[in-house]
Structure formats: structure tokens, C-alpha cells
Interface confidence: low
Amino acid sequence: EKPVYELQVQKSVTVQEGLCVLVPCSFSYPWRSWYSSPPLYVYWFRDGEIPYYAEVVATNNPDRRVKPETQGRFRLLGDVQKKNCSLSIGDARMEDTGSYFFRVERGRDVKYSYQQNKLNLEVTALIEKPDIHFLEPLESGRPTRLSCSLPGSCEAGPPLTFSWTGNALSPLDPETTRSSELTLTPRPEDHGTNLTCQVKRQGAQVTTERTVQLNVSYAPQNLAISIFFRNGTGTALRILSNGMSVPIQEGQSLFLACTVDSNPPASLSWFREGKALNPSQTSMSGTLELPNIGAREGGEFTCRVQHPLGSQHLSFILSVQRSSSSCICVTEKQQGSWPLLT
């Protein structure tokens, strides 16, 4: 009866430089022995080498010398007693490209190289980019752990070195930015800025990086109202604090623009004397049109800002003066109110 030696392994595998790959493999060999049980040794060799003299790339035989260039990077995974010959290749290098074969040895009777089922390994340039993980969106003032990892990398070979760059990192200790993980407490000004994680394999010229744009949610800030006078000279008044009085001539047309800085954008609404103004008068952008103002249409105008991280409001008093002339003029500023605009 012919002895049966079989090997199941894929013909070819491709891996990017610096990354790792697991090649599944199983084998069978003839073994019948009731009186002795010598150890089972298995080997992976580089093709073209003579098994008896060659250094192996991976083995479970402690007495066999392993190639220094594959030591620790090529490893047998799984239980060889269960006929598992799976090979793990870590920190792949361009010079690893080539053909490999598997060999089994047990006692004097079993010595066999599976030359018909070679594994062809191709190492290509690194195009994989690291992954940057964090819970989104970031919230201003709340510490968030960010982690950078290179998919397909594993612990074999020299360690990966990480470096983070970006404006948001300026308050951090430079040492902190050289770890695969960092804790960032984002600020409003960090919204929209870039954060880059660069990964390099120590001792190798293999570098890859990924850049993400930070989406930082932050509470409303810099709330302001600008008043534009339609038939004026394009002048705008800017109101930054509550309670300011703005005198205006009856018949004037105004645009009130409420602006605020927040992320996500806040919703803006206008109120007059505490009552919400008709949506048809206002726009989504927080602009309110007041055409041809009548004597009774003055009062306290309030822009209210609503946002998941906090609400604010800003008010001013529109004091409508009865018309006595049709000129467009600006009187001198008096007693803490704005000039009279006619």
C-alpha cells in the first residue's frame, strides 16, 4: 500500500510590507506504530534549499537552527500533533518574497518534503493606512481616548512606532503623542483641524499615515446681533451685550442678523417682547427682516440660540422715533444708546 502524504495549503499569498498574514495549512502522513512514539517535527523551508543542510524559516524542533532573518517573524501556529501546519508571517519584508515548502519528520520512517504543494509568498509595497478610532463626535472639554492601529499588523518583529500630529495636540506633552493611544480634551478651536497618526516599523523604512478631520461639538459662543439698515449707507451695528437701546426713525427697513459659533450649528429664533416671531419673517440663517417699521413696532428683540450643549439669548431694545424729516442722518451718540438713524 502506497504511503499517503497530503498537504492542504494555498498556492499563493500576498501581504503588504510591514504587515502580517496567517496562512492556514493542514497535513497528513502515514504512521503506524504500537511500540514507540518518536517526536513529530515539522519544518518550513525556503524553496531551492536542501532540507538536511538548510536553515529553516520555522520549526517546532528545538535542535534545528532557524534563519536569523526570519527568527520570530515566521512562526508555526496551531498544534502539529493535530496535523496543523499553519504559518504566521509577521513584519513582512520585501526579501521574504519567494517560494516555501513544508517538510515532516518522525522517527526513521517518516521523512518527507511536500514539494508538490509550495507556498508562493509575495510581499508588496505598503498601501494600508492606519485606523484612528474614537467615539464621535468629540465634545469640547470631554477627554476622549484616541487609538491608532495598523490593520494587518501583529506583534511579530520590531515594534511599531506611532506619532501623532495636529493643532489639537498642542497642549499635550510631546511624549504622549508618541503612543498608539492618547487622550485628547478637544477645544472649540480644534473643530475642523486635522489629526494625523503616522506609523513606522522600527528599523525599517516602512511608513504609513492617516489624517482625519476632527468634528468637535461645542456649546454656542460669540453670540452677536448685527443690524443692517436697508436704505442707509450699508452701515451695520453690532450688538454683543444685552439691553442695548437702538433708536430708529419710523419707516426705516432693517435686517437683523443673529450669528453664533457652535457645532453642530445651533438653531436660532427671534422673539419680540417675549413672543416668537412669525417664521415667515425669519430665515433659517437667523436673519430677521423688519420692513418699513411703524411707531408701535419697537420693543425688546431677542435672538434665542438652542443647542444640545447649552442655550443662550441676546436682546436689544428697538426704540422707534416718529418721523419728522426724510433725511438719512446720524445724530451724536447720547447717554449709552446708539445714534438715531433716520
Epitope: 464621535e136 472639554g141 470631554r142 481616548r145 504622549t176 492618547l182 487622550t183 480634551t185 450643549l309
Partner: antibody, heavy 119, light 112 residues
Framework: QVQLQQSGAELVKPGASVKLSCKAS????????IHWVKQRSGQGLEWIGW????????KYNEKFKDKATLTADKSSSTVYMELSRLTSEDSAVYFC????????????WGQGTTLTVSS | DVLMTQTPLSLLVSLGDQASISCRSS???????????LEWYLQKPGQSPKLLIY???IRFSGVPDRFSGSGSGTDFTLKISRVEAEDLGVYYC?????????FGGGTKLEIK
């Protein structure tokens, strides 16, 4: 096992300052946030702020911003809270508590430090 | 600040009965990352508080399954299905979604 050991009870005069300590053991100090919580006699709990030893990040409850100062000594895995310009309102039990970054809550607490402010 | 209002202030229950504590927040406590950081703590007399529930409904390790949390948005509930003697103490709800983080006023559970 995880432990947060707080310093002993303090009796101090109004206007003075005091520094309470919270020594962590049984886990990697830099991987968890330490929080401080105030409890006045027979009353509820008030969050004071956090200190994250991993990055030195600090966040205060605005109410305690001018009252409490949080610091840490990584070499001894200890977080400190200094309370200044003490008044009788500061008399309370102060707890430190550990929180996992993933939002699991305050999973371990110190035994509390009783602060009495009295002339 | 987010105000956490607990009801009732105190609860008198017989051993084996069910107890229910309500906690209402003055605004939504859904964090911008989508999580709701609502927790429940029990403080027994003379002890530090202990974590029971986090993220609304997840029981902390070692907490008996008679404790359950539920709710969303602004309304949350802690239920104890069969009250035991060791459950007495003050229960606090807590939100960790918006700074400053805030506790509820507490609910005192007493045994009849």
C-alpha cells in the same frame, strides 16, 4: 485588588487651606479617571471634578473652580485635591472615585475624608 | 446645569415587595456621541456609594439581577423586583453626559 485609600479626617480653621489625598492601587493608574465628590452631612452628592492621570487632563464643576485644585503624583499613584479659603460650607465628606473611560461609571470609591471647618 | 429630580424622597417597602424609583432630568442627557450616561448608585448608612447600573440599564458586575434600570431621554427608572434587607440605603441617579455632572437628590429606601 483595586483600592482607593483616602487621607484621614481634617479639622481646620476658616480661611485656611487643606490638601486631601487619594492613593490608588491594584490597577494601572494612568488608565482611569479619578473624580471627587462632596457630601455634606445628611445631604446628597455633588460632583467636584475629574483628573485624568494619563494626560494630566482636569475638568472642574464651575461651582468649585475657585475652591478646588486637583493634582497628581504619578510615582505614588496619588491624586490630590486642595481646598482653599475654607468656610463652614466646605465642611463635608469628600470621596474620590475611579471611572473607566468607556462610561462605565464610578466603579470604585474611596472610604471618604471628613473635613470639618471650625474656629 | 442639568437638574436631576428623584421621586419619591423616601420609600417604605416590605421585604419581597417591588420598589420603583423615578429620576427625571431637566434636559435630554443623550451625549453627543449617542450614549446616555445615566447611572444609579446605592449608599448604605456610613458607607461610600456603590455603582449599580450604568448607561441606563447595564448592571455593574456583581449587582444582583433583581436590580434593573430603564428609560430614555429625560425619564429614567430603577426597579428592585424583590426587596431584601441589604437593599436599604439612599439611591442616587447621576448623569455624566453634560458638564457639570450631577446627582439626583436621593431616595431613601426603608424596610417596613
Amino acid at each position: 485588588q483595586v483600592q482607593l485609600q483616602q487621607s484621614g479626617a481634617e479639622l481646620v480653621k476658616p480661611g485656611a487651606s487643606v490638601k486631601l489625598s487619594c492613593k490608588a492601587s491594584g490597577y494601572t493608574f494612568t488608565e482611569y479617571t479619578i473624580h471627587w465628590v462632596k457630601q455634606r452631612s445628611g445631604q446628597g452628592l455633588e460632583w467636584i471634578g475629574w483628573f485624568y492621570p494619563g494626560s494630566g487632563s482636569i475638568k472642574y464643576n464651575e461651582k468649585f473652580k475657585d475652591k478646588a485644585t486637583l493634582t497628581a503624583d504619578k510615582s505614588s499613584s496619588t491624586v490630590y485635591m486642595e481646598l482653599s479659603r475654607l468656610t463652614s460650607e466646605d465642611s463635608a465628606v469628600y470621596f474620590c472615585a475611579r471611572q473607566e473611560e468607556g462610561g462605565i461609571g464610578f466603579d470604585y470609591w474611596g472610604q471618604g475624608t471628613t473635613l470639618t471647618v471650625s474656629s | 446645569d442639568v437638574l436631576m429630580t428623584q421621586t419619591p424622597l423616601s420609600l417604605l417597602v416590605s421585604l419581597g415587595d417591588q420598589a420603583s424609583i423615578s429620576c427625571r432630568s431637566s434636559q435630554s442627557i443623550v451625549h453627543s456621541n449617542g450614549n446616555t450616561y445615566l447611572e444609579w448608585y446605592l449608599q448604605k448608612p456610613g458607607q461610600s456609594p456603590k455603582l449599580l447600573i450604568y448607561k441606563v440599564s447595564i448592571r455593574f458586575s456583581g449587582v444582583p439581577d433583581r436590580f434593573s434600570g430603564s428609560g430614555s431621554g429625560t425619564d429614567f427608572t430603577l426597579k428592585i423586583s424583590r426587596v431584601e434587607a441589604e437593599d436599604l440605603g439612599v439611591y442616587y441617579c447621576f448623569q455624566g453626559s453634560h458638564v457639570p455632572w450631577t446627582f439626583g437628590g436621593g431616595t431613601k429606601l426603608e424596610i417596613k
